[in-house]
Amino acid sequence: LKVFAKPKITYVENQTAMELEEQVTLTCEASGDPIPSITWRTSTRNISSEEKASWTRPEKQETLDGHMVVRSHARVSSLTLKSIQYTDAGEYICTASNTIGQDSQSMYLEVQYAPKLQGPVAVYTWEGNQVNITCEVFAYPSATISWFRDGQLLPSSNYSNIKIYNTPSASYLEVTPDSENDFGNYNCTAVNRIGQESLEFILVQADTPSSPSIDQVEPYSSTAQVQFDEPEATGGVPILKYKAEWRAVGEEVWHSKWYDAKEASMEGIVTIVGLKPETTYAVRLAALNGKGLGEISAASEFKTQPVQGEPSAPKLEGQMGEDGNSIKVNLIKQDDGGSPIRHYLVRYRALSSEWKPEIRLPSGSDHVMLKSLDWNAEYEVYVVAENQQGKSKAAHFVFRTSAQPTAIPANGSPTSG
């Protein structure tokens, strides 16, 4: 009478190794009948199913990179890792299988290594503007982090404008520079019993941006679109706003308007409004960052067009709702044709389907929300602007809704803003 037995892993052992150590071996023993075969994997890598460098001896298999070797003999399998790296640390699973069944068991490899540091080496700020210098640390066992300035341990009485915050994975040096002296080098040093590492950071005084350059101006009767290139130098910190200044030729006073940098940079266009028809204007641009307003560009001249009467069609941009069957259609006002826009008219439908009732939006609206749309359907939207003189040409936008999810969120009817 032959009695078969399911595999059972009878022995595994956790291991500890040092980084750059020559090798470490993990062992897995199993019982069972027929004799089980043993395979190895980690949470990210199926070692046993990888292509091997050598199949000449099935009892010894080496990975292509030569980093791991699996040896099997009867009921015992070993996994040897060569030239240990700190990324080798973690869970290793051995699985014993035969025709009756299988069994798996985890073991853990702990790799001890000297600290490794990283972070953005150059950090920009300006006097009075608080900034964090981030020193990310990878170490096992965990490291002690110290900050130095000119060899002096921080914080110190000489540097009252400095604070230090530590988390398990990083140390943050919070600096509020109050003079020229606070800019320069800062040293982050991490120490554990395996070793130490230092990383030099430099705190750089940000500058104001250089001037944007005006490419071309597209004038209408009461507005103009100014197309520009971003400043070549941002000063090391993000540009926050653009400032447009314009005046009619012969006038002394410049009119001005601020524009959000993200919106303006997306299209590289700012629109100036409230212009007189058939008038020559000069326009110039400057960029603002946290440090301050940068140098102003050379002025560019243009002449507005005669009154056209009806407005220009708005530009349309769509943002699909997270629910997948709604959309926010942004209306970007263009030229009003010389008289104020009274309202926008919106019509939309699923293609090849019925038109929804027309939506009338007040002149100040900058978007319309279309909700409760059909799933996985193509829609078209038309919008006109209307002033006292008449309607603009229709602006057009096509989009597709998402495929229907399993759970449908509740929705309302179209709304405007």
Partner: antibody, heavy 124, light 106 residues
Framework: QVQLQQSGPGLVKPSQTLSLTCAIS??????????WNWIRQSPSRGLEWLGR?????????DYAVSVKSRITINPDTSKNQFSLQLNSVTPEDTAVYYC??????????????WGQGTMVTVSS | EIVLTQSPATLSLSPGERATLSCRAS??????LAWYQQKPGQAPRLLIY???NRATGIPARFSGSGSGTDFTLTISSVQAEDVGVYYC????????FGQGTKVEIK
């Protein structure tokens, strides 16, 4: 000034295919603010919409249920025209056939421009 | 499909009289309704769109009203050249036409 000029035979034999063309001047068949339609008129059925073609980043066609299995409307961008093909015609298809524009650009939506009409007789 | 019913079938008027033509939809078409005039041997001509907007070049004596299911075309003072058949048409969904109202001068 937009004009639609129709062309095609006035006599078609039963079971054959009726083919008409509508040439556009002053507008584009590829406009995303227009749709190009075929409509017919007979004493028994009155005015009957047959179908349309329109471009909205790709080409679309809508057809009347009554002729869906027999109709094809095709745009021809190189000649700025569109055509009607109606297969397997019977004497019931005898009518005046019109092409017409639906004008969205001017927010008119209805059929603002019509062709001159083509009288098509289906007879052996 | 949306059915449009026009009344009356024929309207006989003296010049200068007011003409009122009616169009009723089998379901709501919002304001997506047009009126056309057709003279013998000619293609229909657009008079009114969106229920109440006069098309380019249409005389002010033509006006439209209504929304939903009930619509009216009014000719404030009928002229001899206004004779013909008048059709309503909806474009809310698949386009359909009414059967027409014939306007004649007494």
């Amino acid at each position: 000034q937009v004009q639609l000029q129709q062309s095609g035979p006035g006599l078609v034999k039963p079971s054959q295919t009726l083919s008409l063309t509508c040439a556009i001047s002053g507008d584009s068949v590829s406009s995303n603010s227009a749709a190009w339609n075929w409509i017919r008129q007979s004493p028994s059925r009155g005015l009957e919409w047959l179908g349309r073609t329109y471009y909205r980043s790709k080409w679309y066609n809508d057809y009347a249920v009554s002729v869906k299995s027999r109709i094809t409307i095709n745009p021809d961008t190189s000649k700025n025209q569109f055509s009607l093909q109606l297969n397997s015609v019977t004497p019931e298809d005898t009518a005046v056939y019109y092409c017409a524009r639906e004008n969205i650009a001017a927010w008119t939506w209805a059929f603002d421009i019509w062709g001159q009409g083509t009288m098509v007789t289906v007879s052996s | 499909e949306i059915v449009l019913t026009q009344s009356p079938a024929t309207l006989s008027l003296s010049p200068g009289e007011r003409a009122t033509l009616s169009c009723r939809a089998s379901q709501s078409v919002s304001s997506y309704l047009a009126w056309y005039q057709q003279k013998p041997g000619q293609a229909p001509r657009l008079l009114i769109y969106d229920a109440s907007n006069r098309a380019t070049g249409i005389p002010a004596r033509f006006s439209g009203s209504g929304s939903g299911t009930d619509f009216t075309l009014t000719i404030s003072s009928v002229q001899a050249e206004d004779v013909g058949v008048y059709y309503c048409q909806q474009y809310h969904g698949t386009p359909t036409f009414g059967q027409g109202t014939k306007v004649e001068i007494k």
